[in-house]
């Protein structure tokens, strides 16, 4: 349905307040170093001209694509250049090529201060003084600071920060009220936004199809009484909607997603009794509701997939007619049958499908050579089960921090050209899967634990893309993104490293570690102990083990020391010369 | 969509030869193996014979063995069946079809041996 003006069509169809923040997500997403005033003051400028083309769509410019307003509008910036290089050039091309560009410049690890906390009473001042300004500053820090973070999610975030400073500012102890609340919201909002970075990356990576498969297994497996033709129509949009918001198109985007919603809440008889109570909430609960949902409960009867998918003589035929939809129907059969399976497995039983299907009905006999296929899949569904187990009973037995530990030593082992901080941001994230995931029953894990090591090491992947080191991390990133987990899996010690220069200063540690909260100091520790790995990566557990039990022991006495400083400084000395004698250096 | 279009068929006398053939079109024709079928009247569908993808590997039902050659030109889509020696228990209608599917397609080209 075209419409003469697109601003106009998308500022009314939003309202103003969803406009104007959506526009400013927009531009923090593709600017991120650009100060909050200035942004203000261009979101002010296209709200602005929204409001004269809805007076009158023929008005000059209404006619204009979204693109083009914005991009001309971010082009406007004076100090484009001296701020952001080479991204200028972007003002130079053409739509749709100008977008393509600012798209590209997106940094995944922007340059920016850590956002730091004020005290409860100086946020409740400012959130008193100026309510708008203070919740669009909040926009502003988490889209500059995460630039694929689904634009309609930040918007119920931002409704939730508003929420707990609107309660909390007026309690007792304001801060026994809003800290908890504002430390979810921070954890919550780094998964989603890591989530989101995933959906992106398979967009933009590995194309639609890629995408397409992986909602067809999600929701197959969130809605098994929905038909195919259901479960298609939703991923179909769902696909319209991320590719929207991945591409920049924010408007776009959370308008589609509001439509979705509303359908999915029309038609829920037809796709899942667990919504009822989603579809009863406002439009941005809903929406994230809708999303988070429990699977439904299987039909009951659901026949054996070989009738269809193995003994059936018109595999073949079906398969020739439509490729897309017969592997569609088969990842839809499969997963509505297997919520405990991850969707990552899913996906990779239909390759192996697709994959002795493109051979076998190539043969003269085509039943003869598939019909063993199934027999293919038992070793790919146990490989997880598998590691899941192993990685579970050690996280049992050390508990999380020991477990990240283990997990930093591993990948370092495996990677060591890629950066400290990455390594050690990455494995303190791949060791969360033990306390996110290892609680739950056999049926849960795997799809709560491989879904979610996708995300974790899909940050690995962005961040590795911007700075190149390792061949083995581009290798497992792009080939293919439904074998990273196997892939990353499978690597063994790089033998072709050169060990690390020993350098005293990466282990010099001052009386400020003393004063850390317990993540902070857990993260110097992980810190030193990947540097230790970088410089002796042949080093056994049982080395690495002793030597961070004495750096513990140091730290923990040092902080009680009465000159800490003194004490960092000649105790540090010895334990550098103790770890040095104690791996070899 | 996917057309499978027979020709060929016709009447013929005992020891006489016909070449069917079969026009694909709406899918990758290179990238399957086909096979014919045939139904006399009253009967149920019987397999007669099917190829791999590149033509490489031919297959027969033991009741058309060294009479009948099954044969395709991937560069026009095309499947082939040559029939020697022919004899009244051949006549039925021949279909093609993908893989060895049992559904029927296409009409089918009607081969009647008779004298």
């Known amino acids: 349905d075209a419409h003469k003006s697109e601003v106009a069509h998308r500022f009314k169809d939003l309202g103003e307040e969803n406009f104007k923040a959506l526009v400013l997500i927009a531009f923090a997403q593709y600017l991120q170093q650009c100060p909050f005033e200035d942004h203000v003051k261009l979101v002010n400028e296209v709200t602005e001209f929204a409001k004269t083309c809805v007076a009158d769509e023929s008005a000059e410019n209404c006619d204009k694509s979204l693109h083009t307003l914005f991009g001309d509008k971010l082009c406007t910036v004076a100090t484009l250049r001296e701020t952001y290089g080479e991204m200028a050039d972007c003002c130079a091309k053409q739509e749709p090529e100008r977008n393509e560009c600012f798209l590209q410049h997106k940094d995944d690890n922007p340059n920016l201060p850590r956002l730091v906390r004020p005290e409860v009473d100086v946020m409740c001042t400012a959130f008193h003084d100026n309510e708008e300004t203070f919740l669009k500053k909040y926009l502003y820090e988490i889209a500059r600071r995460h630039p694929y973070f689904y634009a309609p999610e930040l918007l119920f975030f931002a409704k939730r920060y508003k929420a707990a400073f609107t309660e909390c500012c007026q309690a007792a102890d304001k801060a026994a009220c809003l800290l908890p609340k504002l430390d979810e919201l921070r954890d919550e909002g780094k998964a989603s936004s890591a989530k989101q970075r995933l959906k992106c990356a398979s967009l933009q990576k590995f194309g639609e199809r890629a995408f397409k498969a992986w909602a067809v297994a999600r929701l197959s497996q969130r809605f098994p009484k929905a038909e195919f033709a259901e479960v298609s129509k939703l991923v179909t949009d769902l696909t319209k909607v991320h590719t929207e918001c991945c591409h920049g198109d924010l408007l776009e985007c959370a308008d589609d997603r509001a439509d979705l919603a509303k359908y999915i809440c029309e038609n829920q008889d037809s796709i899942s009794s667990k919504l009822k109570e989603c579809c009863e909430k406002p439009l941005l609960e809903k929406s994230h509701c809708i999303a988070e949902v429990e699977n439904d409960e299987m039909p009951a009867d659901l026949p054996s997939l070989a009738a269809d998918f193995v003994e059936s003589k018109d595999v073949c035929k079906n398969y020739a007619e439509a490729k897309d939809v017969f592997l569609g129907m088969f990842l839809y059969e499969y997963a509505r049958r297997h919520p405990d399976y991850s969707v990552v497995l899913l996906l990779r039983l239909a390759k192996t499908y697709e994959t002795t299907l493109e051979k076998c009905c190539a043969a003269a006999d085509p039943h003869e050579c598939y019909a063993k296929v199934f027999d293919e899949f038992k070793p790919l569904v146990e490989e997880p089960q598998n590691l899941i187990k192993q990685n579970c009973e050690l996280f049992e037995q050390l508990g999380e921090y020991k477990f990240q530990n283990a997990l930093l030593v591993r990948y370092t082992k495996k990677v060591p050209q890629v950066s400290t901080p990455t390594l050690v941001e990455v494995s303190r994230n791949l060791g969360k899967v033990g306390s996110k995931c290892c609680k739950h029953p056999e049926a849960k894990r795997m799809p709560c634990a491989e879904d979610y090591l996708s995300v974790v090491l899909n940050q690995l992947c962005v961040l590795h893309e911007k700075t190149p080191v390792s061949d083995r991390v581009t290798k497992c990133c792009t080939e293919s993104l439904v074998n990273r987990r196997p892939c990353f899996s499978a690597l063994e010690v790089d033998e072709t490293y050169v060990p690390k220069e020993f350098n005293a200063e990466t282990f010099t540690f001052h009386a400020d570690i003393c004063t850390l909260s317990e993540k902070e100091r857990q993260i110097k520790k992980q810190t030193a102990l990947v540097e230790l790995v970088k410089h002796k990566p042949k080093a056994t557990k049982e080395q690495l083990k002793a030597v961070m039990d004495d750096f513990a022991a140091f730290v923990e006495k040092c902080c009680k020391a009465d000159d800490k400083e003194t004490c960092f400084a000649e105790e540090g000395k010895k334990l550098v010369a103790a770890s040095q004698a104690a791996l070899g250096l | 969509e996917v057309q499978l279009v027979e020709s060929g068929g016709g009447l013929v006398q005992p020891g006489g030869s016909l070449r069917l053939s079969c026009a694909a079109s709406?899918?990758?024709?290179?990238?399957?193996?086909m096979s014919w079928f045939r139904q006399a009247p009253g009967k149920e569908r019987e397999f007669v014979s099917a190829?791999?993808?590149?033509?490489?590997?031919?297959r027969y039902a033991e009741s058309v063995k060294g009479r009948f050659t099954i044969s395709r030109d991937n560069s026009k889509n095309t499947l082939y069946l040559q029939m020697n020696s022919l004899r009244a228990e051949d006549t039925a209608v021949y279909y093609c079809t993908i893989g060895r599917s049992a559904s029927r397609w296409g009409q089918g080209t009607t081969v009647t041996v008779s004298s």
């Open positions: 190829i791999d993808s590149g033509g490489a590997d031919t």
């Open positions: 709406g899918f990758t024709f290179g990238s399957f193996g």
